[in-house]
Amino acid sequence: EPPTACREKQYLINSQCCSLCQPGQKLVSDCTEFTETECLPCGESEFLDTWNRETHCHQHKYCDPNLGLRVQQKGTSETDTICTCEEGWHCTSEACESCVLHRSCSPGFGVKQIATGVSDTICEPCPVGFFSNVSSAFEKCHPWTSCETKDLVVQQAGTNKTDVVCGPQDRLR
């Protein structure tokens, strides 16, 4: 009876279990009743990082110097290239696909410490009573407007991203 499931590092095809190709190799042909799975090593600047049945290897990532990127770790047949940013610049994400001089703080966050040549911007969440409605690399959280000092009342509460809205007091006739 043909199998319905295969062991680890195997795959089911044409009612039989074939061996997966090891990392660094791609599939050329599936196994048969009489032959083993045929695999081939990935070419230069290619990789596969898992046991697989891929017919094409993945291209190594290109660390584009026009984006401020450079190679941190050269790729192998089993691993992708790892990019990092030029000295003094910061990756915009874990994947490091682009570089910024320093990060900015999103709305709801204020700048705790402005970036220097050796450290990135440090952001902090705006506490109750403060807000930031902009992305900035230098602006701190701003205090909510004090309606009372303007002889007004709060018409709309503030948040970490918005100021309070003040309005006239209801006058008793």
Partner: nanobody, 116 residues
Framework: EVQLLESGGGLVQPGGSLRLSCAAS???????EMWWVRQAPGKGLERVS?????????YYADSVKGRFTISRDNSKNTLYLQMNSLRAEDTAVYYC?????????WGQGTLVTVSS
């Protein structure tokens, strides 16, 4: 495509003044916080000054406070840096930059040399 074109640099004696300009195109200038950043020969990038989109709030590094003034004209898509009481240590290439400071969005800079 974002373009930032700095101008106004040159050779000036200590104590002198210069006004740098940065002409911006390829983005909505009035929506962006803008910065002046400089790089002295053989040194890293130093954040000099910043201004919010409306031009109402500014930041200055301690090294230039009281001597430099940042401003912007949103109708002309231009950023300025007025530099007074220049010192030898202000010698650098000056760049303008927009949030979020992508590497590829930087201009060529303008060289300021303070020397007698």
């Amino acid at each position: 495509e974002v373009q930032l074109l700095e101008s106004g640099g040159g050779l000036v004696q200590p104590g002198g003044s210069l006004r740098l300009s940065c002409a911006a195109s390829g983005f909505t200038f009035r929506d962006y916080e803008m910065w002046w950043v400089r790089q002295a020969p053989g040194k890293g990038l130093e954040r000099v000054s910043a201004i919010n989109p409306q031009g109402t709030r500014t930041y200055y590094a301690d090294s230039v406070k009281g001597r430099f003034t940042i401003s912007r004209d949103n109708s002309k898509n231009t950023l300025y840096l007025q530099m007074n009481s220049l010192r030898a240590e202000d010698t650098a290439v000056y760049y303008c930059a927009k949030l979020p400071f992508f590497f590829e969005e930087w201009g060529q800079g303008t060289l300021v040399t303070v020397s007698s």
